[in-house]
């Protein structure tokens, strides 16, 4: 066969679906690799072909679209399972071709099992809710396109294993779940089960997501440098190790990049000749506020180093701050026998 543009195995799109549930999988070519959509390709006389490689096999084989009740079918650029089976797991390829053009991509599909409490190896999306922020909603994800708008499904929401009914601050509202005032106690896994009829059969879609309650932007502050501060002086003798921690508190801010860095005499440590190491550690509070500590270390400090300016800087979406460390050279204690004795007139 003639050459085909092979985009390889697209592991970025590791698709996971539940066993015994419908699944609709769009060919990734049109979403991520080609600059035209399926309709354009179809109009231009291109054909979309599907095949797969079973788990632990090397042999590519065509997909059987003649299974009872059309269990697997294709509609435009979508591969349908009604429903999936465990042994549908494998690498699926969609290929777009005609006599002069060919492009294909493969992607892994994993059919996973769940228990009666919806626990499974499925990677769960995380939805962040602001603590004590007023009404916030989560929506049952990835259910578009499974049934027409004329079909009215039933939706049941669960927190962990428990059906959500008569919860204090969590109210199911169809495809949405409303949190009146989100609290830390609302952290957990939430599952919506969507049940709908199709051609005399009943299908279930199970979608689980993790809710994480985070700090509210209403309470967010610019970075706060706890150390260095005015109360601590780093007094060292030449030859000693100088250790200065820069400890910064960052409020949680959605999509904010928190940065901490040192400057020595106005330059980044990488841009100066002295032997400096910087070690960073990060810790988080329950609401994902962040404390970053960068310890600046000079193993054998010189008297020149003790005259330098050491400034800790921090930046977030809320602002930028800087604090200088108070560094000075320790005045050596007088040696009694010589220096004090001289004061008493001894020779």
């Amino acid at each position: 066969s003639e050459r085909c543009d092979d985009w390889g195995l697209d592991t970025m799109r590791q698709i996971q679906v539940f066993e015994d549930e419908p699944a609709r999988i769009k060919c990734p070519l049109f979403e991520h690799f080609l600059k035209f959509n399926y309709s354009t390709a179809h109009s231009a006389g291109l054909t979309l072909i599907w095949y797969w490689t079973r788990q632990d096999r090397d042999l590519e084989e065509p997909i059987n679209f003649r299974l009872p009740e059309n269990r697997i079918s294709k509609e435009k650029d979508v591969l349908w399972f009604r429903p999936t089976l465990l042994n549908d797991t494998g690498n699926y390829t969609c290929m777009l071709r005609n006599t002069t053009y060919c492009s294909k991509v493969a992607f892994p599909l994993e059919v996973v099992q769940k228990d009666s409490c919806f626990n499974s190896p499925m990677k769960l999306p995380v939805h962040k809710l602001y603590i004590e922020y007023g009404i916030q909603r989560i929506t049952c994800p990835n259910v578009d396109g499974y049934f027409p708008s004329s079909v009215k499904p039933t939706i049941t929401w669960y927190m962990g294993c428990y059906k959500i009914q008569n919860f204090n601050n969590v109210i199911p509202e169809g495809m949405n779940l409303s949190f009146l005032i989100a609290l830390i106690s609302n952290n957990g896994n939430y599952t919506c089960v969507v049940t709908y009829p199709e051609n005399g059969r009943t299908f279930h879609l199970t979608r689980t997501l993790t809710v994480k309650v985070v700090g509210s932007p209403k309470n967010a502050v610019p970075p706060v440098i706890h150390s260095p501060n005015d109360h601590v002086v780093y007094e060292k003798e030449p030859g000693e190790e100088l250790l200065i921690p820069c400890t910064v508190y960052f409020s949680f801010l959605m999509d904010s990049r928190n940065e901490v860095w040192w400057t020595i005499d106005g330059k980044k440590p990488d841009d100066i000749t002295i032997d400096v190491t910087i070690n960073e550690s990060i810790s988080h509070s329950r609401t994902e506020d962040e404390t970053r500590t960068q310890i600046l270390s000079i193993k054998k400090v010189t008297s020149e180093d003790l005259k330098r300016s050491y400034v800790c800087h921090a930046r977030s979406a809320k602002g930028e701050v800087a604090k200088a460390a108070k560094v000075k050279q320790k005045v050596p204690a007088p040696r009694y026998t010589v220096e004090l004795a001289c004061g008493f007139g001894a020779t």
Epitope: Y133, G134, P217, K218, A220, V221, P222, V224, H226, D230, Y249, S251, D289, K318, G319
Partner: antibody, heavy 118, light 112 residues
């Protein structure tokens, strides 16, 4: 440029209603508190209240609760301070200010002078 | 309500000399996250107030480094290392521990 532009000076009679405005620009209006501050002639600053335009969460100073209404319209990036029935003692300069975090009112409007006199 | 008390209420200063304003709150302003919810503002004659210091000790953008804030809990100080003529005006501290913010009564700084 981040700025807050307030509506112009007002001269009113006691008992009349009034709504003054504060329009934000150059930043995400829904992501910062907007506060209102009163300064009576020759006096100091008094904090009246704040609003979070994102969801209209409003907090008032006990001294101003029930006396004024703070509101916001995020579609036009504008906060409002409203009186139903003005009194002579409402004569003052009213400032709006953006709080950048914690309290930190880092951007202030130019002030709106309200004069209430019969 | 948290009451903020400033002293002195009037501060005559000599250009080039240091100056210091004290602010005391009726309860601790130390937040559980380790910062103090206290700001300092300056209102120059005929102007809107401007932020000088936030969270107790952080200089606001564009504020000269002769201004510094210190203190924790209930006692705070604003220092001007060398007063300049343009520093005259009313200085206010403001607390924001609760969402009932309150200003101090103000300190008038004027040139001797």
């Amino acid at each position: 440029e981040v700025q807050l532009v307030q509506s112009g000076a007002e001269v009113k009679k006691p008992g009349e209603s009034l709504k003054i405005s504060c329009k934000g620009s150059g930043y995400s209006f829904t992501s910062y508190w907007i506060g209102w501050v009163r300064q009576m002639p020759g006096k100091g600053l008094e904090w009246m209240g704040i609003i979070w335009p994102g969801d209209s969460d409003t907090r008032y100073s006990p001294s101003f609760q029930g006396q004024v209404t703070i509101s916001a319209d995020k579609s036009v990036n504008t906060a409002y301070l409203q009186w139903i029935s003005l009194k002579a003692s409402d004569t003052a300069i009213y400032y709006c200010a953006r709080s950048s975090g914690g309290t930190a009112m880092d951007v202030w409007g130019q002030g709106t002078t309200v004069t209430v006199s019969s | 309500d948290i009451v903020m008390t400033q002293s002195p209420l009037s501060l005559p200063v000599t250009p080039g000399e240091p100056a210091s304003i004290s602010c005391r709150s009726s309860q601790s302003l130390l937040h559980s996250n380790g910062y103090n919810t206290l700001d300092w503002y300056l209102q120059k004659p005929g102007q809107s107030p401007q932020l000088l210091i936030y969270l107790g000790s952080n200089r606001a953008s564009g504020v000269p480094d002769r201004f510094s804030g210190s203190g924790s809990g209930t006692d705070f100080t604003l220092k001007i290392s060398r007063v300049e003529a343009e520093d005259v005006g009313l200085y206010y501290c403001m607390q924001g521990l609760q969402t009932q913010w309150t200003f101090g009564q103000g300190t008038r700084v004027e040139i001797k």
